[in-house]
Interface confidence: low
Amino acid sequence: KKVVLGKKGDTVELTCTASQKKSIQFHWKNSNQIKILGNQGSFLTKGPSKLNDRADSRRSLWDQGNFPLIIKNLKIEDSDTYICEVEDQKEEVQLLVFGLTANSDTHLLQGQSLTLTLESPPGSSPSVQCRSPRGKNIQGGKTLSVSQLELQDSGTWTCTVLQNQKKVEFKIDIVVLAFQKASSIVYKKEGEQVEFSFPLAFTVEKLTGSGELWWQAERASSSKSWITFDLKNKEVSVKRVTQDPKLQMGKKLPLHLTLPQALPQYAGSGNLTLALEAKTGKLHQEVNLVVMRATQLQKNLTCEVWGPTSPKLMLSLKLENKEAKVSKREKAVWVLNPEAGMWQCLLSDSGQVLLESNIKVLPTWSTPVQP
């Protein structure tokens, strides 16, 4: 008995060949002897089987003595032994239909688990091996699970089902719903406008949900909600926004927030959460704001930064085109009795300048000018 493997939802073609290379009487039956289809002269006739409207043949091949049974939109329950009766001979084909589906949805939030479930006909004992887009192999029986999905798991998963030394391959497209970056940091001088962007790492036709930005200012004892918004079919609408600071939000994706000006009291960390419709859990992106201020008070030139800085960052004060007067791995540096000229305050990481603020120190009889 010939064995053919099929995929749920696909089309399969079971072959049946006569010795005479001409159109002769034939018909296909299932194991219960119920007629599926056959011919009367040059016409195809369909029996009252459950396959009635999913069964077909290739009339163009009949004259060559080929009488295939085509079954469309395969279902697991189509697994059966199919018998072709032609020229007083019987050709038997065992069809085994398998289905591989992802748990509930193929769009999963970062950190969630992916479970692939194999649907198989009774009496079969298949083995399954799946390869993720990043080349990770997982093996299993009826179910395969991958916990803690990462962004790199987005893409096509290729799964091979093995049965009776025959194999059938499934391709499942998995979309991991996440922001492009888990965390980002923005460096700004005091007074500058701040732009926060939250690009998504996926595209879907319709995107609906709601979001909120919670902010923990370095100077504040507790966090507060800066803005809440709704997302409907990729259109953004603000629900509620604090008066101080008064954030502005773009109406289209990617999610975009504007802080009118960087101030020391705003420096800190934020957490943008996005809850998507019909999804349990939320997407998160952390955003950090570092603010720099350079000031001269009487005979003291000071440079300060607020916000989440790494201990390896260097804060320096230097007179333009000269060596740094002071460099420290601290959040404030100062120079007493600074020379007149253009002073630069620099925040750098391994020689790369992240933030720069200039302040002009005038001769002692005049007041400082901040450009």
Epitope: T11, H27, K35, G38, Q40, G41, F43, L44, T45, K46, G47, P48, N52, D53, R54, D56, K72, N73
Partner: antibody, heavy 115, light 108 residues
Framework: LQQSGPELVKPGASVKMSCKAS????????INWLNQRTGQGLEWIGE????????YYNEMFKGKATLTADKSSNTAYMQLSSLTSEDSAVYFC???????????WGRGTLVTVSA | LTQSPASLAVSLGQRATISCKAS??????????MNWYQQKPGQPPKLLIY???NLESGIPARFSGSGSGTDFTLNIHPVEEEDAATYYC?????????FGGGTKLEIK
């Protein structure tokens, strides 16, 4: 099966009518097209398998009718070309149920060919 | 397919019998591929009986079909006022499916 509205067309022209399916898996069932001239009986034009797009025609309508299907919108279409007054009729789409007969029908599209 | 009579008038509560004769057998593998429809003006046909004798879901039991090979019959008993319509037989054993010329039933 929801069919498109009536059509008044000139001789020699073409017309394309639609049949939108709902309430079942579109690719599971063949869509058949039939016509009925005023006061006359029913004639089978052809059938289309929405899953594959395969169409089979009554010899009498080969070259006259073209059947297509769009899986994304669950809609079957029939285009009639080189229309004459003989083509004035009500055109139905239909599908089989569990048995052999046409159990589900559209309400029909009236095509009137007139100069 | 030849239907007879072309029209008939039956009294309320009585039996209506419509015949359909095929030019060749519509039987295949033990099944008779004959179907019966009812059509009222301005409406699409409604399937009553499929495979010669099977009552379609939702159709009253006063409708019944019989026959095999080339000779088939549709019976309506007892006839009700709402049964006034045109009735068609149709074979589906081979392509193209064909219909009878119709029988117009009038209720007296």
């Amino acid at each position: 099966l929801q069919q498109s509205g009536p059509e008044l067309v000139k001789p020699g022209a073409s017309v394309k009518m639609s049949c939108k399916a709902s309430g079942y898996t579109f690719t599971d069932y063949v869509i058949n097209w039939l016509n009925q001239r005023t006061g006359q009986g029913l004639e089978w034009i052809g059938e289309i398998y929405p899953g594959s797009g395969s169409a089979y025609y009554n010899e009498m309508f080969k070259g006259k009718a073209t059947l297509t299907a769009d899986k994304s919108s669950n809609t079957a279409y029939m285009q009639l070309s080189s229309l004459t007054s003989e083509d004035s009729a009500v055109y139905f789409c239909a599908r089989r149920g569990t048995g052999t007969g046409f159990a589900y029908w559209g309400r029909g599209t009236l095509v009137t060919v007139s100069a | 397919l030849t239907q007879s009579p072309a029209s008939l008038a039956v009294s309320l509560g009585q039996r209506a019998t419509i015949s359909c004769k095929a030019s060749q057998s519509v039987d295949y593998d033990g099944d008779s591929y004959m179907n019966w429809y009812q059509q009222k003006p301005g409406q699409p046909p409604k399937l009553l009986i499929y495979a010669a004798s099977n009552l379609e879901s939702g159709i009253p039991a006063r409708f019944s079909g019989s026959g095999s090979g080339t000779d088939f019959t549709l019976n309506i008993h007892p006839v009700e006022e709402e049964d006034a319509a045109t009735y068609y037989c149709q074979q589906s054993s081979e392509d193209p499916p064909t219909f009878g010329g119709g029988t117009k039933l009038e209720i007296k």
